[in-house]
Interface confidence: medium
C-alpha cells in the first residue's frame, strides 16, 4: 500500500488524524467491541488498514475513516491482509495504532 505523493496528501493525512483523534477520544465503546486483524502498518500502509477495517460492518463511527483510507490507498486491486499471525485486536486498539502511524507519517513524510 504505497502512499501517493501529491500536494493534497498532507491535508488528507491531517483529516485522517482529526477523524481518528475524534474516535480514540470518544469514550463510547467502538463498534461494540468488534475485533479486527492486527496488521503491519509499516509494511502495508493504509491499504492493509483499509482491508482490516473492511470486515467491520454496521459501525457508523468508522465510515468516514474507511472513506479517507480508501482515498489514501492507491492500489488497483485488493491485496491480502498482511496480518500478524492469528492476532486479533479490538477495533479501538487498531484505530489507536493507526493514529500513531498516521501522525508519524504526517511528521516525517514522505510527501
Amino acid at each position: 500500500g504505497p502512499v501517493p505523493r501529491s500536494v493534497s496528501l498532507p491535508l488528507t493525512l491531517k483529516e485522517l488524524i482529526e477523524e481518528l483523534s475524534n474516535i480514540t477520544q470518544d469514550q463510547t465503546p467502538l463498534c461494540n467491541g468488534s475485533m479486527v486483524w492486527s496488521v503491519d502498518l509499516a509494511a502495508g500502509g493504509f491499504c492493509v488498514a483499509l482491508d482490516s477495517l473492511t470486515n467491520i460492518s454496521n459501525c457508523n463511527a468508522i465510515y468516514r475513516t474507511q472513506r479517507i483510507l480508501h482515498g489514501l490507498c492507491n492500489r488497483k486491486a485488493p491485496t491480502t491482509v498482511s496480518s500478524l499471525p492469528d492476532t486479533k485486536i479490538e477495533v479501538a486498539h487498531f484505530i489507536t495504532k493507526l493514529l500513531s502511524y498516521t501522525k508519524q507519517l504526517f511528521r516525517h513524510g514522505p510527501f
Partner: antibody, heavy 123, light 110 residues
Framework: QIQLVQSGPELKKPGESVKISCKAS????????MHWVKQAPGKGLKWMAW????????TYADDFKGRFVFSLEASASTATLQISNLKNEDTATYFC????????????????WGQGTSVTVSS | DIVLTQSPVLAVSLGQRATISCRAS??????????MHWYQQRPGHQPKLLIY???NLVSGIPARFSGSGSGTDFTLTIDPVQADDIAAYYC?????????FGGGTKLELK
C-alpha cells in the same frame, strides 16, 4: 509523571460566574479526552461532560447544559470549566479526570484525576 | 441512563474480607469486556482508579484488591482489609454515555 493540577478554591455569590482550570503535565495533552466530575458536599460523583482535547468539542450530560462551558487552552495543556449565574446547588468540588483509549491507558476508565476545586456559592 | 446501585455503608473488621457490590440497571458488557471500573476515594482526596474493565488491577494497586462480575452484577473485594483502605468506593460504567457512577459505598470499621 502524569499530573492534573487544578486552580484554587472559590467563594462566590449567587448569580456570579466562576472559572476553574485544570493544567495537565507528564503526557501529551491532545492524546487524551478530559472529563469533569461534580461532587456535592457529602455526596457521590456525578459526571458532567467530556471534552475532546484534539478538536475542543465538548459532550455534555443533560444536567449540565446551559450554564456550564467546557473549553481548552490546548497550547497551555489546560482544560477549563466556566459556570455562569451560579446557584446554591452549584456548591461542590469539581474534578477534572483524564481518559482515553490510547495505548497504555485503561480503556474507557478515568485513570488520572486533579485534586479538585471547591466552589462555594453563598450569599 | 444506566443506573448503578451500591449499598451506602459496609462495616468490616481489620484483617477481614470486604465485599462491595454494584448492580447495573442494564448490561455493561460489550463483546469482549464488561466495562465496569472501581475507584477509591479517601476523605478529602480525589478518586483513584483501582480496577478497570471489571477485573484488571491498576499498576501499583495492592493485590488485596480484586474485581469480578459480568453483565449487571459486579463485586470489588478487599482481602484482607487494612486501615488505609477506609474510604468510599465507587463503581462506574463505561458502556454508554452519560457515564454514571454508583452512589458509593463507605467502608467503615466495626
Amino acid at each position: 509523571q502524569i499530573q492534573l493540577v487544578q486552580s484554587g478554591p472559590e467563594l462566590k455569590k449567587p448569580g456570579e460566574s466562576v472559572k476553574i482550570s485544570c493544567k495537565a503535565s507528564g503526557y501529551t495533552f491532545t492524546d487524551y479526552a478530559m472529563h469533569w466530575v461534580k461532587q456535592a458536599p457529602g455526596k457521590g460523583l456525578k459526571w458532567m461532560a467530556w471534552i475532546n482535547t484534539y478538536t475542543g468539542k465538548p459532550t455534555y450530560a443533560d444536567d449540565f447544559k446551559g450554564r456550564f462551558v467546557f473549553s481548552l487552552e490546548a497550547s497551555a495543556s489546560t482544560a477549563t470549566l466556566q459556570i455562569s449565574n451560579l446557584k446554591n446547588e452549584d456548591t461542590a468540588t469539581y474534578f477534572c479526570a483524564r481518559a482515553g483509549r490510547t495505548e497504555g491507558t485503561h480503556y474507557y476508565a478515568m485513570d488520572a484525576w486533579g485534586q479538585g476545586t471547591s466552589v462555594t456559592v453563598s450569599s | 441512563d444506566i443506573v448503578l446501585t451500591q449499598s451506602p455503608v459496609l462495616a468490616v473488621s481489620l484483617g477481614q474480607r470486604a465485599t462491595i457490590s454494584c448492580r447495573a440497571s442494564q448490561s455493561v458488557s460489550i463483546s469482549s469486556s464488561d466495562l465496569m471500573h472501581w475507584y477509591q476515594q479517601r476523605p478529602g482526596h480525589q478518586p483513584k482508579l483501582l480496577i478497570y474493565r471489571t477485573s484488571n488491577l491498576v499498576s501499583g494497586i495492592p493485590a488485596r484488591f480484586s474485581g469480578s462480575g459480568s453483565g449487571t452484577d459486579f463485586t470489588l473485594t478487599i482481602d484482607p482489609v487494612q486501615a488505609d483502605d477506609i474510604a468510599a468506593y465507587y463503581c462506574q460504567q463505561g458502556r454508554e454515555s452519560p457515564w454514571t457512577f454508583g452512589g458509593g459505598t463507605k467502608l467503615e470499621l466495626k
